[in-house]
């Protein structure tokens, strides 16, 4: 960068080098150039020579002010015009930042993904900050007292192997930058709590000549645990609003459900489970997508190994029974 | 050999416009930072808007006097600087010149037009 | 903006004369200062650059010297056509700043 460069002299920022975005800010450069009085000194910022707010304070050093700086990161360098030189000589550069203090974290949600052999820790981390900040996530065994911290930028994943301390942890964590430091409240945490089952996946979709026609949904999880909660929400592709079905599964075969449906309609539905009384859901599935027949033919959609939403074939289909609807999102 | 043709003034009445061009040659247009420096009968230089030099990404500047009133502008293409003047008042009567600048002094100045704001 | 003041406003001399112009800067210019002539109805000319370097084409009798906020321009020996205004112009600081004009007469 900019700070690798020779330099001739000195440039500094004032406050500092990584401000508060918005901050009127001073940029100094000072010359010690041999056989050199500077007759002019020019700041430039990411190449383009700045015109306006220069101030010279001393023989050697001048100042650039600027209002309500907002810009993240900017390349700054300064040059003087020295007598007798034809072409400006460099002084020195610095890359300056700004951007804000982290927000408190909140919403910490810790859980593992079944056969994931990880424990994965997520936050909400508030405001973009625009600068470097880290996450240190402390994890606490509520039984041996003892703390491990585990460094990251984003979200972090803990391998089960090593929380040995038992099953019940405190899990907070604490957002540091240059420009500030805050924590999060303490989540508490059982191992045993906090399982998702392994995903569940639709994999065809069939619609059975009938009286009234029925199309039949196939979905399937690799899940050991045995009482799992499950939701299947389904609708028109042109609907807003989905109708939520709810099931209690057992995973030792494909699951089949049945819904009677409008004809010559697309239809778009997923799949989300939960271990029966716990807290957290899988992510709904990958949207599954089944037109209707016009009339009785049958009709069979299969899911392909691959991301089924950019595929369009493969489909999902929904009841028009009396089902409650409902308009949760993800 | 620098060049520097001004047209477009004459008189006009206070509150109308004006525009008046600068017509360059001999020099490297881009690289040059381009004003327009005004002259009141009898009376001493005045500085009153500035385009800068590529290098400077062609900054404006403007005097108080004329802020918000005056607008300068380069056509690189045509070598050519203009100064749009809105809502003239007796007071902007004067010779306007043309002027070149590389380093921040004027090197060279055009011959100026009158530009005269009466009713 | 940095002020700079001329003086005299005007003086009478005569050919042949020594003639002494000097400009004040309202801070430290670090010779960043030019002088221009300017006659009756023409544009202003460049005479001196960074307060002692003389422009090409201009007579070797006009001269600058100065530094700190103090700058002089000397006509070491007047001529029938140096009769004219003369303007200095600081460009330390931006924006550049005029004085307000020496008018040097015929006595």
């Known amino acids: 960068g900019i700070t690798n460069i020779n330099c001739s002299g000195h440039i500094w920022v004032e406050p500092a080098t990584i401000f508060k975005m918005g901050m009127n800010i001073s940029i100094y450069c000072q010359a010690a150039i041999k056989n050199c009085q500077p007759r002019k000194l020019h700041f430039y910022k990411n190449g383009i020579k700045e015109r306006f707010q220069i101030t010279r304070i001393n023989k050697t050093t001048a100042r650039l002010w600027y209002k309500n700086f907002l810009e993240p990161h900017a390349s700054m360098y300064c040059t003087a015009e020295c007598p007798k030189h034809f072409q400006e000589t460099l002084i020195c550069g610095k890359d300056i930042s700004s951007g804000y203090p982290p927000d408190i974290p909140d919403e910490v949600t810790c859980v593992i993904y079944e056969y994931s052999g990880n424990m994965t820790c997520t936050w909400n981390a508030g405001k973009l900050t625009y600068i470097d900040t880290k996450y240190v996530v402390h994890v606490k065994s509520l039984e041996t007292e003892e703390e491990q911290q585990y460094l990251t930028s984003s979200y972090i994943n803990i391998s089960t192997d090593s929380l040995q301390g038992g099953k019940k942890y405190l899990v907070w964590v604490q957002a540091a930058n240059a420009l500030g430091m805050e924590e999060s409240k303490q989540l508490q945490i059982h191992l045993d709590d906090i399982v998702i089952p392994s995903a569940a996946v639709i994999s065809r979709a069939e619609t059975i000549n009938a009286t009234v026609p029925k199309t039949i949904i196939y979905w399937d999880s690799q899940t050991t645990i045995e009482k799992v909660s499950c939701e299947m929400r389904y609708k028109a592709t042109t609907n807003q609003t989905w109708n939520v079905k709810e099931f209690d599964t057992n995973f030792t075969y494909v699951q089949q459900s049945e819904f009677y449906l409008e004809p010559n309609i697309k239809y778009v539905f997923q799949v989300r489970c939960q271990e029966t009384g716990k807290r957290y859901w899988q992510p709904w599935s990958s949207p599954f997508f089944h037109k209707t027949p016009e009339t009785v033919p049958q009709v069979t959609s299969k899911a392909f190994q691959h991301d089924t939403w950019n595929s369009g074939l493969t489909v999902a289909s929904i009841s028009t029974g009396h089902l409650t609807s409902d308009n949760r999102g993800d | 050999q620098v060049q520097l043709v001004e047209s477009g003034g004459g008189v006009v009445q206070p509150g109308r416009s004006l525009r008046l061009s600068c017509a360059a040659s001999g020099f490297d247009f881009n690289s040059y930072g381009m004003s327009w420096v005004r002259q009141a009968p009898g009376k001493g230089l005045d500085l009153v808007a500035d385009?800068?030099?590529?290098?400077?990404?062609?900054?404006?500047y403007y005097a108080d006097s004329v802020k918000d009133r005056f607008t300068i502008s380069r056509d690189n293409s045509k070598n050519t600087l203009y100064l749009q003047m809105n809502s003239l008042r007796a007071e902007d009567t004067a010779v306007y010149y043309c002027?070149?600048?590389?380093?921040?002094?004027?090197?060279?100045w055009g011959q100026g037009t009158l530009v005269t704001v009466s009713s | 903006d940095i002020q700079m003041t001329q003086s005299p406003s005007s003086l009478s001399a005569s050919v042949g004369d020594r003639v002494t112009i000097t400009c004040r800067a309202s801070q430290d210019i670090y010779t960043n200062l030019a002088w221009y002539q300017q006659k009756p109805g023409k544009a202003p000319k460049l005479l001196i650059y960074h307060a002692s370097s003389l422009q090409s084409g201009v007579p070797s009798r006009f001269s600058g010297s100065g530094s700190g906020t103090d700058y002089t321009l000397t006509i070491s020996s007047l001529q029938p056509e140096d009769f004219a205004t003369y303007y200095c112009l600081q460009d330390s600081e931006y924006p550049p700043t005029f004085g307000q004009g020496t008018k040097v007469e015929i006595k």
């Open positions: 002027a070149v600048h590389h380093s921040d002094y004027f090197e060279y």
């Open positions: 385009i800068n030099s590529k290098s400077y990404n062609y900054a404006t």
